[in-house]
């Protein structure tokens, strides 16, 4: 909320850099054809670019990404019986970020 | 994406804890009259609870929060009058988190 002037530190810009975020491993990511299963873990940490740039016309974007395969457990329920499987999910980590110009949207003709 | 089993580390759950997130200040301070000439900084870092819990019926929630006033500089131009403001924005940091039971939504009667 916006208040009157109190003892407040000057706000520091959240610079454009990688930060740890939580990525939800959705069931659709594992198997689109079957709904009768559970995934463990339900979410993992990833590194993602975030923050602000010096200008409204530029955005914090990744300049270097790395794909990281991780193993998740898939528990299928078949005729009330749990079947344990392992699946690989490829996560995308951002390694480096940069404030890059946002291409102006093309006018609709 | 789901790949075949490669050399993949077991996925680790993103535990319920505080992580650094980016909070956009400019949205808070944008007035409907569009009088803002300049708001600085446009975004700041905050600490927020995120991550997953062991069960779908519990959610990662803050158990302790702290309000942190920060000073934002702002130039508004209203009817040719430049108004130089130092506004205080109160940010909410999460200090501690816990997996808490989600109260079941009451049925609509």
């Amino acid at each position: 909320s916006l208040g009157s002037l109190t003892v407040a530190e000057p706000a520091m810009i959240a610079e454009c850099k990688t930060r740890t975020e939580v990525f939800e491993i959705s069931r659709r990511l594992i198997d689109r054809t079957n709904a009768n299963f559970l995934v463990w873990p339900p979410c993992v940490e990833v590194q993602r670019c975030s923050g602000c740039c010096n200008n409204r016309n530029v955005q914090c974007r990744p300049t270097q990404v790395q794909l990281r395969p991780v193993q998740v457990r898939k528990i299928e329920i078949v005729r009330k019986k749990p079947i344990f499987k392992k699946a690989t999910v490829t996560l995308e980590d951002h390694l480096a970020c940069k404030c890059e110009t946002v291409a102006a949207a093309r006018p609709v003709t | 994406s789901l790949g075949s089993l490669t050399v993949a580390e077991p996925a680790m759950i993103a535990e319920c804890k505080t992580r650094t997130e980016v909070f956009e200040i400019s949205r808070r301070l944008i007035d409907r009259t569009n009088a803002n000439f300049l708001v600085w900084p446009p975004c700041v870092e905050v600490q927020r609870c995120s991550g997953c819990c062991n069960n779908r019926n519990v959610q990662c929630r803050p158990t302790q929060v702290q309000l942190r006033p920060v000073q934002v500089r702002k130039i508004e131009i209203v009817r040719k009058k430049p108004i130089f403001k130092k506004a205080t924005v109160t940010l909410e940091d999460h200090l501690a988190c816990k997996c808490e039971t989600v109260a079941a939504a009451r049925p609509v009667t």
């Epitope: 810009i13 740039c53 010096n54 200008n55 409204r56 016309n57 | 803002n36 000439f37 300049l38 708001v39 600085w40 900084p41 446009p42 500089r73 130039i75 131009i77 040719k80 009058k81 430049p82 130089f84």
Partner: antibody, heavy 116, light 107 residues
């Protein structure tokens, strides 16, 4: 330290345009506006307008409204002032200055001479 | 536009003298006034902001006062390096406007 470095002297013919640059360093460019002020030979200071380095918002003095365009390039931390339809009485030193509620740092000035 | 007037337009004083320049606004500008020093061939330099706040690194012999429409700029003990032109500037309304300046030199 804060520095504003301007482009060099320009000689232009009446009716032409001039574009003066102002490269900023030593501070967070987007956190301030850049003002442009001119000074005719032996005369006082005249404010032309300003631009927000963060979002490109501009505000021009009425006198220059139709002839001036101020722009900013944050990839190089550079502000530009273009003046069109030059006349002999536009001969002046053009200054850029870091602006908030005062002009606390100034460029060295760019002399623009308009002569046929 | 707000008109700014300064007096005197020029003055000569001896080293060590107290020098006073006045600046008048054509309407109430509260304390929204700055003072600048400009030496020949150089860019202006901010000395005082908000009518009376001395900028960092500016010698304490410079001071400013006033509010509303009448403002004063004082050099308590004139030094040879103070030879320059001094301008007041309002930031209460757009366009920002400067006074015509006061030229200070040594007798």
């Amino acid at each position: 330290q804060v520095q504003l470095v301007q482009s060099g002297t320009e000689v232009k013919k009446p009716g032409a345009s001039v574009k003066v640059s102002c490269k900023a360093s030593g501070y967070t460019y987007g956190a301030y506006a850049i003002s442009w002020v001119r000074q005719a030979p032996g005369q006082g200071l005249e404010w032309m307008g300003w631009i927000s380095a963060y979002n490109g918002n501009t505000n021009y003095a009425q006198k220059f409204q139709d002839r001036v365009t101020m722009t900013t390039d944050t990839s190089t931390n550079t502000a530009y002032m273009e003046l069109r339809g030059l006349k002999s009485d536009d001969t002046a030193v053009y200054f850029c200055a870091r602006a908030w509620n005062s002009f606390d740092y100034w460029g060295q000035g760019t002399l623009v001479t308009v002569s046929s | 536009d707000i008109q700014m007037t300064q007096s005197p337009s020029s003055l000569s004083a001896s080293v060590g003298d107290r020098v006073t320049i006045t600046c008048q606004a054509s309407q109430d500008i509260r304390k929204n006034l700055n003072w600048y020093q400009q030496k020949p061939g150089k860019a202006p330099k901010l000395l005082i902001s908000d009518a009376s706040t001395l900028e960092t690194g500016v010698p304490s012999r410079f001071s400013g006062s006033g509010s509303g429409t009448d403002f004063t700029f004082t050099i308590s003990s004139l030094q040879p390096e103070d030879i320059a032109k001094y301008y007041c500037q309002q930031y209460y309304n757009l366009p920002f406007t400067f006074g015509p300046g006061t030229k200070v030199d040594i007798k």
